[in-house]
């Protein structure tokens, strides 16, 4: 939802969290603002305090319940408002009717680990976190490997078009330090976006055996 120079963007993690970012040009830095969530079908509502993340943007997380509880469904619509204090009153700065399963961003994958490493290849696995059982296999992943002397932005993206929580990296250089990241996205939702990248997993390929042609 956009009001003039105001932008209000929220995503549902598919379980019990709605994360929101509100940006407003010329907004007062010392104003107290919050996001208020009012579902159309539920008897709970939730508020979080917007905290500055840059000169003109604020963010907060609406914690709807226990991390793995399924607090919203595809039928729910949540009215989300940005409220800022003006004296003794609260002023509505932005508002949107939020459809959770059209605006998904899952948590970053966790528990990355090296399953097996060789001189030229490495098998890595991970787990998804706080993802609705609704998705079943309807997820896709992107992965990237950081090679020495390169940046993450330069790393080619590897796409896994199915729910596959492992990857075998090939054509690696022996005895070399690498880092690996993965992210996940449900196939559902018009405004759904990729999760944040996972924490990088550092690993080192095995050295080539002496006297062997590599």
């Amino acid at each position: 939802a956009v009001n003039g120079t105001s932008q209000f963007t929220c995503f549902y993690n598919s379980r019990a969290n709605i994360s929101c970012v509100w940006s407003q040009d010329g907004a007062l830095q010392d104003t107290s603002c919050q996001v208020h969530a009012w579902p159309d079908r539920r008897r709970w509502n939730q508020t979080c305090e917007l905290l500055p993340v840059s000169q003109a943007s604020w963010a907060c997380n609406l914690i709807l319940g226990a991390p793995d509880s399924q607090k919203l469904t595809t039928v729910d619509i949540v009215t989300l408002r940005v409220l800022c204090r003006e004296g003794v009153r609260w002023r509505v700065m932005a508002i949107q009717d939020f459809k959770p399963f059209e605006n998904l961003r899952l948590m970053a994958p966790i528990s990355l680990q090296v399953v097996h490493v060789e001189t030229h290849r490495c098998n890595i696995s991970w787990e998804i976190s706080q993802a609705s059982h609704y998705f079943e296999r309807h997820l896709e992943f992107e992965a990237r490997t950081l090679s020495p002397g390169h940046t993450w932005e330069e790393a080619p993206l590897l796409t896994l078009k199915q729910k596959q929580e492992w990857i075998c990296l090939e054509t690696l250089t022996p005895d070399t330090q690498y880092e690996f990241q993965v992210r996940v996205k449900p196939l559902q939702g018009e405004f759904t976006t990729w999760s944040p990248w996972s924490q990088p997993l550092a690993f080192r390929t095995k050295p080539a055996a002496l006297g062997k042609d590599t």
Epitope: R41, R43, S69, T73, T74, V75, Y134, H138
Partner: antibody, heavy 120, light 106 residues
Framework: EVQLVESGGGLVQPGGSLRLSCAAS????????MSWVRQAPGKGLEWIGE????????NYAPSLKDRFTISRDNAKNSLYLQMNSLRAEDTAVYYC?????????????WGQGTTVTVSS | DIQMTQSPSSLSASVGDRVTITCSAS?????MHWYQQKPGKAPKRWIY???KLASGVPSRFSGSGSGTEFTLTISSLQPEDFATYYC?????????FGGGTKVEIK
Amino acid sequence: EVQLVESGGGLVQPGGSLRLSCAASGFDFSRYWMSWVRQAPGKGLEWIGEINPDSSTINYAPSLKDRFTISRDNAKNSLYLQMNSLRAEDTAVYYCARHDYDEGIYFDYWGQGTTVTVSS
Amino acid sequence: DIQMTQSPSSLSASVGDRVTITCSASSRVIYMHWYQQKPGKAPKRWIYDTSKLASGVPSRFSGSGSGTEFTLTISSLQPEDFATYYCQQWSSNPPTFGGGTKVEIK
């Protein structure tokens, strides 16, 4: 104790109209979504439609929305179903049901039902 | 609309038997709910959110499943369990019910 009591059923000719009522007690009616559900003789359950607490949102089964209208009066703790252009296939027991939500959405209380017979 | 297919449509079983009723959805659903209905009576909420027993429902009942396949299980059938059981989804509008499974005495 939560109670839902339907009334207004009866025998009506094809093409006729009928208005069903559901009287609610034992809970704060004005806070709950409500639905109508019907069951034809010997058949399964069919959702008719729902209404939110302040009547600002009313949804219907696509096949019924042109002939059926749901309304409510929170001051009277009452839910209504106006049925027009009735057909023989509308013969059924009509239930009102209260919605509840834990994580999913379901019906936690049902009325005893009122029978509508459409026949000439 | 999401179509719900219950199987079997009816079954005959003896007291003490283990009974399993299956509900298949034509598309993925987040939760399945189950209702018990006895002749001439209104349905009663029986199992909600796939596996949670409604108040007063005996622990011999259980629910499970995800995606498109869900089950209601009675571990040891008792005389008061003879009834018709309906599954219901509300993961997308409109909510839909299965055709019902009638549990009869053998």
